[in-house]
Interface confidence: low
């Protein structure tokens, strides 16, 4: 299994109401993707084999798949109370902002420090499940024709 | 214009040693994670290993049949990769090329490679 | 560990639209590239992501990849394309493998 990953969290990200990405420039997103986000969730993964998890979170479109990637990528899920600050999620974060029209105004940033929750985060195997599945939304989103992933 | 350019190769005795150089230029090298593929005299390509780039943790793969054997680095400041080969086997025998990787591991610029011949 | 099988050899017309296929279990799920590499020279990739031409690559030259099987499709083949092809998925465990090889002859 993929060894402990020790990050810092200041600040929680979260999101207001469903966010229609139709209007994305999703060739930029995908370069973004493919030169570096890519690298980033292989990084969190290492050590893990691409068969330990199923995918089971699909979809149908490229702003369906960002959708996806969104909610998997900031929603904090049982099992993996956040990734919103690792590597990966950051750069997600800019390009969604930087390329899909508005988006930065559906985010609110919860400025108060994370007191309550422990400052050293072990990366959990539902977290490790999780970014599989982004994994392959991720692959979806850049291949919606050719890549049933 | 990227540019690789290997250098080191030889002809050197089985369980002997030798030290591959790779300089780089014309891009970003400590960005990049780095290759080295072989090809042995009339045959196909075959992967010897790579380099992930310092900000992914700079970490190493091989392949099994130099696994233990080869070891791979990097000097970013040097813009250069190593592959510094030990307890060599005739079967090791081959252009050495190194390789640049882009999206989906593939590999966008390669050098001209560099021959080593592993014979008594 | 995966496994990519080519077919030794292709031919084809000067003119005519030469096909090197690619196969491997479900390979349609994987990335696949290919390269070019002529004799004495390093290859070159020539289609990365399955159907992605780099820059520089003439658009006679294209890729698709679905089920067991890749293939390289060259339309108006030249004398110059005469080369070995090599393909190479990219798999999330075994991550560079590579095709045994084609040698694209261009007839006439």
């Known amino acids: 299994m993929g060894s402990s990953h020790h990050h810092h969290h200041h600040l929680e990200v979260l999101f207001q109401g469903p966010y229609d990405f139709t209007n994305c420039d999703f060739e930029k997103i995908k370069a973004a993707y493919l030169s570096t986000i890519s690298k980033d969730l292989i990084t969190y993964m290492s050590g893990t084999k691409s068969t330990e998890f199923n995918n089971t979170v699909s979809c149908s479109n490229r702003p369906h798949c960002l959708t996806e990637i969104q909610s998997l990528t900031f929603n904090p899920t049982a099992g993996c109370a956040s990734l919103a600050k690792e590597m990966f999620a950051m750069k997600t974060k800019a390009a969604l902002a930087i390329w899909c029209p508005g988006y930065s105004e559906t985010q609110i940033n919860a400025t108060q420090a994370m007191k309550k929750r422990r400052k050293r985060k072990v990366t959990t195997n539902k977290c490790l499940e999780q970014v599989s599945q982004l994994q392959g939304l991720w692959r979806r989103f850049n291949r919606p024709l050719l890549k049933q992933q | 214009e990227v540019q690789l350019v290997e250098s080191g190769g030889g002809l050197v005795k089985p369980g002997g040693s030798l030290r591959l150089s790779c300089a780089a230029s014309g891009f970003t090298f400590s960005d990049y994670w780095m290759h080295w593929v072989r090809q042995a005299p009339g045959k196909g390509l075959e992967w010897v290993g790579h380099?992930?780039?310092?900000?992914?943790?700079?970490?190493?793969d091989y392949a099994a049949p130099v696994k233990g054997r080869f070891t791979i680095s990097r000097d970013d400041s040097k813009n250069t990769l190593y592959l510094q080969m030990n307890s060599l086997k005739t079967e090791d025998t081959a252009v050495y090329y190194c390789?640049?990787?882009?999206?989906?591991?593939?590999?966008?610029?390669w050098g001209q490679g560099t021959l080593v011949t592993v014979s008594s | 560990s995966y496994e990519l099988t080519q077919p030794l050899s292709v031919s084809v017309a000067l003119g005519q639209t030469a096909r090197i296929t690619c196969s491997g279990d479900?390979?349609?799920?994987?990335?696949v590239h290919w390269y070019q590499q002529k004799p004495g020279q390093a290859p070159v990739l020539v289609i990365y992501?399955?159907?992605e031409r780099p820059s520089g690559i003439p658009e006679r030259f294209s890729g698709s990849n679905s089920g067991n099987t890749a293939t390289l499709t060259i339309s108006r083949a030249q004398a110059g394309d005469e080369a070995d092809y090599y393909c190479q998925a990219a798999d999330w465990v075994d991550f560079y493998v590579f095709g045994g090889g084609t040698k694209l002859t261009v007839l006439g």
């Open positions: 479900n390979i349609g799920s994987k990335y």
């Open positions: 992501g399955d159907n």
């Open positions: 390789a640049r990787e882009i999206y989906y591991y593939a590999f966008d610029s």
């Open positions: 380099i992930k780039s310092k900000t992914d943790a700079g970490t190493t």
